[in-house]
């Protein structure tokens, strides 16, 4: 946020950036958290996007006994592995196929014991706050999904009949990692030494990081004809004078009518 | 780039007999998985025969005791005697192939493919 500044007081003003500003010249360059000509004024909203989607990585291993292992499958660019790559993936598309998350697999390792498959199942959603039950539930159904797959695709006589099949008990999960994205945590750390007055405020699903001095909202306090102004100690209601008024009070709600003061009266509305 | 390309069949008389062969490049024939498939009008592609890079076989049980695969590794070909041929033989013959050592039956597991070799068994 920038105030340009002309004429001869430039100068002074170029001295007095204050909470970090830095003076390009003829302006003060305010930090992200501040405004206003010396940088004097806190921002009452602060950007927190949340990112479009959010990604989950589960990894699992399976034993794939339909292929038999061999040092080829070793190399990541060999011809052999890129085509079990392909029909493992195929495999796991049409496994995993219900589940809108899923974007795909990724394989880490192959290793002896049939085809071991150390891999990584991707998932993602579009980001809405209750994106982290949304996850879990996708979690569970990968679980569900390759444990009935790995126990119905099995050899029999040591021929399989379907695309690949599996040892029943060679399915584990290691590790589910979701990508963590918390507003409120987002919000504190952006607000810095103003975190305790900055609060998340949802709006058509997406967070709002602000302070009550942001209008529109439920936290939002009201200063009547004053002005909201941050300080450290909180959100405060700088009151105006009219050429009628004073107004006082903790949101400027008590007017006082200049005339009568003169008179020696006060009269309160 | 892997080519498969088939030859040998044909019409031939219930009882009769006929040698399959696919000519393979662009991968190391040795190595991978080969098999005959077939389809016949209206009905799913099936599984033949199989042969593993060491020699390992294995038949549909509608061929077993009279068709017979084989591979010569030095002539990068794949082969399919088939013996006391049936009208219900008649299909599209198909060489498959894959790199991999695999024990499946399933179609969906071979990447490469030939055109297809017709065989009618008729009297």
């Known amino acids: 946020r920038t105030t340009t500044c002309f004429g001869d007081g430039c100068q002074n003003t170029a001295s007095r950036c204050k909470n970090g500003g830095t003076w390009d010249g003829l302006k003060c360059q305010c930090p992200n958290l501040y405004y206003g000509e010396l940088c004097e004024e806190v921002v009452s909203s602060i950007d927190i996007g949340p990112p479009e989607t959010i990604s989950a990585q589960m990894e699992l291993t399976v034993t794939v006994t339909s292929v038999k292992f061999t040092e080829e499958l070793k190399n990541h660019s060999s011809q052999e592995f890129q085509e079990f790559k392909q029909t493992f993936t195929e495999q796991m598309n049409i496994v995993y196929s219900g589940i809108p998350e899923y974007v795909g697999v990724n394989i880490t390792k192959l290793r002896l014991g049939s085809v071991v498959v150390e891999h990584d199942v991707l998932l993602r959603t579009k980001y809405t706050p209750e994106y982290k039950t949304v996850l879990d539930n996708a979690t569970e159904v990968v679980k569900e999904k390759i444990t009935k797959v790995t126990t119905q695709q099995i050899m029999i006589n040591d021929i399989c009949s379907d695309m690949m099949c599996f040892n029943t008990t060679g399915t584990q999960v290691q590790n589910i990692t979701v990508t963590q994205y918390d507003p409120e945590e987002d919000c504190r750390k952006m607000a810095k030494e103003y975190g305790d007055y900055f609060v998340v405020e949802y709006r058509d699903q997406k967070p709002y990081c602000i302070s009550p001095c942001e209008p529109g909202f439920s936290v939002s306090k009201n200063c009547n004809l004053g002005k909201c102004q941050m300080s450290l100690s909180g959100p405060q209601c700088l009151c105006v004078t009219t050429e009628t008024h004073w107004y006082s009070g903790e949101t400027c709600n008590q007017g006082t009518q200049k005339s009568l003061v003169y008179g020696h009266h006060h009269h309160h509305h | 780039e892997v080519q498969l390309v088939e030859s040998g069949g044909g019409l031939v008389q219930p009882g009769g007999s006929l040698r399959l062969s696919c000519a393979a490049s662009?991968?190391?024939?040795?190595?991978?998985?080969m098999a005959w498939f077939r389809q016949a009008p209206g009905k799913e592609r099936e599984g033949v025969a199989f042969?593993?890079?060491?020699?390992?076989?294995s038949y549909a049980e509608s061929v077993k005791g009279r068709f017979t695969i084989s591979r010569d590794n030095a002539k990068n070909s794949l082969y399919l005697q088939m013996n006391s041929l049936r009208a219900e033989d008649t299909a599209v013959y198909y060489c498959?192939?894959?790199?991999?050592?695999?024990?499946?039956?399933?179609?969906?597991?071979?990447?490469?493919w030939g055109q297809g070799t017709m065989v009618t068994v008729s009297s």
């Open positions: 498959a192939a894959s790199l991999l050592y695999l024990m499946t039956v399933n179609a969906a597991a071979y990447p490469y």
């Open positions: 662009g991968f190391t024939f040795s190595r991978g998985t």
């Open positions: 042969i593993n890079s060491d020699g390992r076989t």
